[in-house]
């Protein structure tokens, strides 16, 4: 069904401006490279309008093209630390359903202590996004240093 | 078909698509870590549609969730310079009203000469955003190396 | 004034939500610093809705303010390699028509192997965007490491 036809008398919700901005809750147990996120007004400036959290991972509720963005800063880090613990890598991907599993965005820290990037990608209702941080260094939980979000852009 | 023709019963203002992209004007005097921005068609590719500049700082005119983005490149910089002058840090935050003062986004340069990031954040009418660059290195004023902008995303 | 009330008679096309996300096809021949891009559902998660590719370069079809974003990762790269081959620089600009030629966004790799940034910029129908990578290092063609996209934001 074309968006244009359904679009004629539609309120904000139907425009599908789903959006979420999350802050880091915690890292996973040993052998689980995933970062676990949290969001909501009680936590400060994080929020979920449309997408939901499922055990700390972000689940999409509306099909469309999304802008996905992330910043992760390593805690207790200097360029020396970063290069000594290289490679520390951050990957954002669809981790479920398994049939749609794919890496969407990947960066290594090399001699830096922060990575930040963004990209446009099609996502479908039910896609769960996971952010995997591999390496021994811990991410900062400061809300201005580590965050992850999505923004619905168009059908 | 031009957007304007199809647009006749919808003033753009009501869409709330406030947006601004600024270029660096100058750094502050000693003891003032703020960067001072400028924008407008006479200056090239910078612009303000909705938000305003107040003494070089960006003031928001419409409540909503915004995508805030920034890139700052240090002038006369190499990885050696950057690490020797470490820590050089860039922070973007709400600096007024004082009651809403908070750091939204923070990055250190470590051994790099450019930082770039973006995030979604709720902003309210009257919020003024400040960008603080701490350290002794100067930012480049080249318009393709240093810029700061906001984009209204949804109410 | 609520967006929902004003929204009632606007089809998607007239909203002008042109958007594209491209993956790297190849680098240019000797003496051509341009990166050549490709996009489309057959290639995975890249797409063009509005803009077009012209010999691997992105051509804009609708006037407006766009969010331009890019990530480029160097292949076979370590912080040592990156600094040894310095300066490796990535620039995104309007390369045609010649009368509008300008650099929009520029970053150097220094000791890092990935650059990522984004900015808002006015673009006009017919503008062709080129991404120039100067230096001897090759970019990764992995779709989660190197990508380039634009998103129409407002008229």
């Amino acid at each position: 069904q074309r968006f244009a036809q359904a679009q004629q008398q539609l309120p904000l919700e139907s425009l599908g401006w789903d959006v979420a901005e999350l802050q880091l809750n915690h890292t996973g147990p040993q052998q689980d490279p995933r970062l676990y996120w949290q969001g909501g007004p009680a936590l400060g400036r994080s929020f979920l309008h449309g997408p939901e959290l499922d055990k700390g991972q972000l689940r999409i509720h509306r099909d469309g093209i999304y802008m996905v963005h992330i910043q992760v800063t390593l805690a207790i880090c200097s360029s020396t630390t970063a290069s000594r613990h290289h490679p520390t890598t951050l990957a954002v991907g669809i981790c479920s359903p398994a049939s749609r599993s794919i890496s969407l965005l990947r960066l290594s820290f090399h001699q830096g202590c922060t990575i930040a990037s963004q990209r446009l990608t099609p996502l479908a209702r039910g896609d769960t996004l996971c952010t995997n941080l591999t390496g021994t260094l811990l991410p900062s939980r400061n809300t201005d240093e580590t965050f992850f979000g999505v923004q619905w852009v168009r059908p | 078909q031009r957007f304007a023709q199809a647009q006749q019963q919808l003033p753009l203002e009501s869409l709330g698509w406030d947006v601004a992209e600024l270029q660096l004007n100058h750094t502050g005097p000693q003891q003032d870590p703020r960067l001072y921005w400028q924008g407008g068609p006479a200056l090239g590719r910078s612009f303000l549609h909705g938000p305003e500049l107040d003494k070089g700082q960006l003031r928001i005119h419409r409540d909503g969730i915004y995508m805030v983005h920034i890139q700052v490149t240090l002038a006369i910089c190499s990885s050696t310079t950057a690490s020797r002058h470490h820590p050089t840090t860039l922070a973007v935050g709400i600096c007024s009203p004082a009651s809403r003062s908070i750091s939204l986004l923070r990055l250190s340069f470590h051994q790099g000469c450019t930082i770039a990031s973006q995030r979604l954040t709720p902003l309210a009418r009257g919020d003024t955003l400040c960008t603080n660059l701490t350290g002794t290195l100067l930012p480049s004023r080249n318009t393709d190396e240093t810029f700061f902008g906001v984009q209204w995303v949804r109410p | 004034q609520r967006f929902a009330q004003a929204q009632q008679q606007l089809p998607l096309e007239s909203l002008g939500w042109d958007v594209a996300e491209l993956q790297l096809n190849h680098t240019g021949p000797q003496q051509d610093p341009r990166l050549y891009w490709q996009g489309g559902p057959a290639l995975g998660r890249s797409f063009l809705h509005g803009p077009e590719l012209d010999k691997g370069q992105l051509r804009i079809h609708r006037d407006g303010i766009y969010m331009v974003h890019i990530q480029v990762t160097l292949a076979i790269c370590s912080s040592t390699t990156a600094s040894r081959h310095h300066p490796t620089t990535l620039a995104v600009g309007i390369c045609s028509p010649a009368s509008r030629s300008i650099s929009l966004l520029r970053l150097s790799f220094h000791q890092g192997c990935t650059i990522a940034s984004q900015r808002l910029t006015p673009l006009a129908r017919g503008d062709t965007l080129c991404t120039n990578l100067t230096g001897t290092l090759l970019p990764s063609r992995n779709t989660d490491e190197t990508f380039f996209g634009v998103q129409w934001v407002r008229p």
Epitope: T88, T89, S108, G135 | - | H26, T73, L137, L138, R141
Partner: antibody
Framework: QVQLQQWGAGLLKPSETLSLTCAVY????????WSWIRQPPGKGLEWIGE???????TNNPSLKSRVTISLDTSKNQFSLKLNSVTAADTAVYYC????????????WGQGTLVTVSS | DVQMTQSPSSLSASVGDRVTITCRTS??????LNWYQQKPGKAPKVLIY???TLQQGVPSRFSGSGSGTDFTLTITSLQPEDFASYYC?????????FGQGTKVEIK
């Protein structure tokens, strides 16, 4: 210094399954592509496939669906299984690390000669 | 798949000679080409990546050139330790493919 050490059965009968394991020492497992490459006696090199540390694998279509590459990140090991082998699969099998973005095989195992004979 | 054609398949040369090996690909691959050296009973070793970048620790008598579909490996002054087999390999796409090899023998 990164070292790759590989092991597995060297003599197989047709229709059996080839099974090799490669252990990575002295370096990180994450951030790299881990590959298998083979070389029939007196011939050139053939890429079998690779697996990224996240578990995503890509195989050479010429080997159809006979190939399975898996990894065990807890042991810093990755493995190759090639089923329904024939004499044409007789070769020296190498494990190798695909550096950074998988664009260069910068570290190799010592190689294992696998002979398929009835 | 990208087909790789290496020539010659073998050559005889003397110490001090200049040796050139060529590699042609069936489609455009930019500069996504590596060169490896392999000695009998040993694993291959990278010499050149990205068509022309010398791998750290490799002597400067080795050089690579070309882009697109035609590539060359040159050894300016052949040394005794250079007698070996040489392979080109494309990393433009999967499956990664190798040339059939060039064996450099002592004349």
């Amino acid at each position: 210094q990164v070292q790759l050490q590989q092991w597995g059965a060297g003599l197989l009968k047709p229709s059996e399954t080839l099974s090799l394991t490669c252990a990575v020492y002295g370096g990180s497992f994450s951030g790299f592509y881990w590959s298998w490459i083979r070389q029939p006696p007196g011939k050139g090199l053939e890429w079998i496939g690779e697996i990224y540390h996240s578990g995503h694998a890509t195989n050479n279509p010429s080997l159809k669906s006979r190939v399975t590459i898996s990894l065990d990140t807890s042991k810093n090991q990755f493995s190759l299984k090639l089923n329904s082998v024939t004499a044409a699969d007789t070769a020296v099998y190498y494990c190798a690390r695909g550096g950074n973005s998988g664009y260069i095989f910068d570290y190799w195992g010592q190689g294992t000669l696998v002979t398929v004979s009835s | 798949d990208v087909q790789m054609t290496q020539s010659p398949s073998s050559l005889s040369a003397s110490v001090g000679d200049r040796v050139t090996i060529t590699c042609r690909t069936s489609q455009y691959i930019g500069r996504y080409l590596n060169w490896y050296q392999q000695k009998p009973g040993k694993a291959p070793k990278v010499l050149i990546y990205g068509a022309s970048t010398l791998q750290q620790g490799v002597p400067s008598r080795f050089s690579g050139s070309g882009s697109g579909t035609d590539f060359t490996l040159t050894i300016t002054s052949l040394q005794p330790e250079d007698f070996a087999s040489y392979y080109c390999q494309q990393t433009y796409s999967t499956p990664r493919t190798f040339g059939q090899g060039t064996k450099v023998e002592i004349k």
